[in-house]
């Protein structure tokens, strides 16, 4: 007899989720020598333990602590890149600028990037049919709590000058409700972080405005300054050329107009 299953508003767990997480873990530990000591089966067990058999609207950061402990990693000072609503460009950047890191360049972020998962209360099954939607169902769902947990940790461990890439095409360039605005900003440690430098990415040649003067950026500056962290802002008028110059920094055209 088919068992009744809670119907959520969001899409279900990504197909082959356990295999994907395990395979990503193995690949990551092979490529990153400093993480070779990590036992991927233990990582999967800890990941699974955070949400399996638990009501998917009642997940806590505590549930993910065993996983966070196993995935402990440090980023060198001045090498943390945060982002908000502009993931693709941030990742293209760190793929070229290999000594800078987004959360998704770290083990735990890499494991979960673009995946969805949830379980069911009192069963060992993974729900491939539907998972809670943050808006329509609940915010304390397995995916949202995971990203809140690892984002908090990522921000807490950052040091030196931290960079953040922001999408200048959005109506709210800095959004207090984004993961960056609600979690990361508030967990940068003033005793370790000297400055936050925002890179506001322009959407196209049509926009000649100084988006660093945008009211939401001024709001970000205010929040950061109140936390005794210095704030700087740069317009990236030409993201296409920005990436090109990361690849070829010696070209004379990359040194001009700064």
């Amino acid at each position: 007899v088919p068992r009744w299953r809670q119907q959520w508003s969001g899409s279900g767990t990504t197909s082959r989720f356990p295999e994907t997480v395990l395979a990503r873990c193995v690949k990551y530990t092979e490529v990153h020598p400093e993480m070779r000591h990590v036992d991927c089966q233990s990582v999967w067990d800890a990941f699974k333990g955070a949400f399996i058999s638990k009501y998917p609207c009642n997940i806590t950061e505590e549930d993910y602590q065993p996983l966070v402990k196993l995935g402990t990693q440090t980023v060198p000072c001045n090498k943390t890149l945060l982002w908000s609503r502009i993931k693709d460009l941030a990742h293209q950047f760190t793929q070229v600028q290999r000594d800078m890191f987004t959360l998704e360049d770290m083990l735990l972020g890499y494991l979960a990037d673009d995946l969805t998962w949830c379980g069911e209360f009192n069963t060992f099954e993974i729900n491939y049919q539907s998972c809670p939607d943050w808006r329509k169902d609940c915010s304390n769902n397995p995916v949202s709590v995971f990203w809140k947990t690892v984002s908090r940790r990522f921000a807490e461990t950052a040091c030196g000058v931290v960079h953040v890439m922001l999408n200048g095409s959005r109506s709210k360039i800095f959004d207090k409700n984004s993961t960056f605005g609600s979690v990361e900003v508030h967990n940068l440690q003033p005793e370790k972080v000297q400055a936050l430098e925002a890179w506001v990415i322009h959407g196209g040649r049509e926009d000649s405005r100084d988006l660093c003067q945008d009211p939401t950026i001024k709001e970000l500056e205010s929040i950061i300054s109140k936390r005794n962290i210095r704030f700087f802002c740069k317009n990236i008028y030409r993201p296409d050329k920005f990436l090109q110059c990361v690849k070829n920094p010696e070209d004379s055209s990359c040194l001009s107009g700064i």
Epitope: G204, R205, E206, S208, R209, D210, K234, N235, I236, Y237, R238, D240, K241, F242, Q244, C245, N248, D251, S252, S253, C254, S256, G257, I258
Partner: antibody
Framework: EVQLLESGGGLVQPGGSLRLSCAAS????????MSWVRQAPGKGLEWVST????????YYADSVKGRFTISRDNSKNTLYLQMNSLRAEDTAVYYC????????????????WGQGTLVTVSS | EIVMTQSPATLSVSPGERATLSCRAS??????LAWYQQKPGQAPRLLIY???TRATGIPARFSGSGSGTEFTLTISSLQSEDFAVYYC?????????FGQGTKVEIK
């Protein structure tokens, strides 16, 4: 030394077509947006079209939209302007010009210009 | 589109004197304005960008000022090689537009 050399101008009948070329040297062509600017005899300057670094975006003056096509071949360091359905009012010297294409500050002006090629549309 | 209006159309100045050229935009262009010099039979040459920044190799006697809608190009002491036509251009909004030019001639 930055050099821009236009070619392809000449006499063409109304309704005809012409393809202008601009050979660039002395700089990394693929790192710059490029434009065409024209000047009718005895008149002022008029911006015609701009193409971004990799040709991903193109912009046109309303007076040429739908008739002219700007393109580039970064492997040949060459900018092109395909002109169709030419009219008498398109008669002008056509200049190829480079935009500084800064990352951290806005640009949209022209720091280097070619010597121009004359296009005459007449029957 | 933004209309750029230059004045005067012609300016008669003696060598060694100061020349002041004006450019007005029909709406604000912030500081996104350039000035060019063009001599007969030659391509234009960039003088000023960002309303006030001199381009590479441009003598200090050329200076630009203004922001928003009102801009000025000043040539502090005219040399013989400065007699030419001067154009302003806005690059704040598409389409980019030029003024009609000011001819600086020998008095």
């Amino acid at each position: 030394e930055v050099q821009l050399l236009e070619s392809g101008g000449g006499l063409v009948q109304p309704g005809g077509s012409l393809r202008l070329s601009c050979a660039a040297s002395g700089f990394t062509f693929s790192f710059y947006d490029m434009s065409w600017v024209r000047q009718a005899p005895g008149k002022g300057l008029e911006w015609v079209s701009t193409i971004t670094l990799h040709g991903g975006d193109t912009y046109y003056a309303d007076s040429v939209k739908g008739r002219f096509t700007i393109s580039r071949d970064n492997s040949k360091n060459t900018l092109y302007l395909q002109m169709n359905s030419l009219r008498a009012e398109d008669t002008a010297v056509y200049y190829c010009a480079r935009d500084p294409s800064y990352i951290y500050s806005t640009s949209g002006y022209f720091d280097y210009w070619g010597q121009g090629t004359l296009v005459t549309v007449s029957s | 589109e933004i209309v750029m209006t230059q004045s005067p159309a012609t300016l008669s100045v003696s060598p060694g004197e100061r020349a002041t050229l004006s450019c007005r935009a029909s709406q604000s262009v912030s500081s996104n304005l350039a000035w060019y010099q063009q001599k007969p039979g030659q391509a234009p040459r960039l003088l000023i960008y960002g309303a006030s920044t001199r381009a590479t190799g441009i003598p200090a006697r050329f200076s630009g000022s203004g922001s928003g809608t009102e801009f000025t190009l000043t040539i502090s002491s005219l040399q013989s090689e400065d007699f030419a036509v001067y154009y302003c251009q806005q690059y704040n909004n598409w389409p980019w537009t030029f003024g009609q030019g000011t001819k600086v001639e020998i008095k």
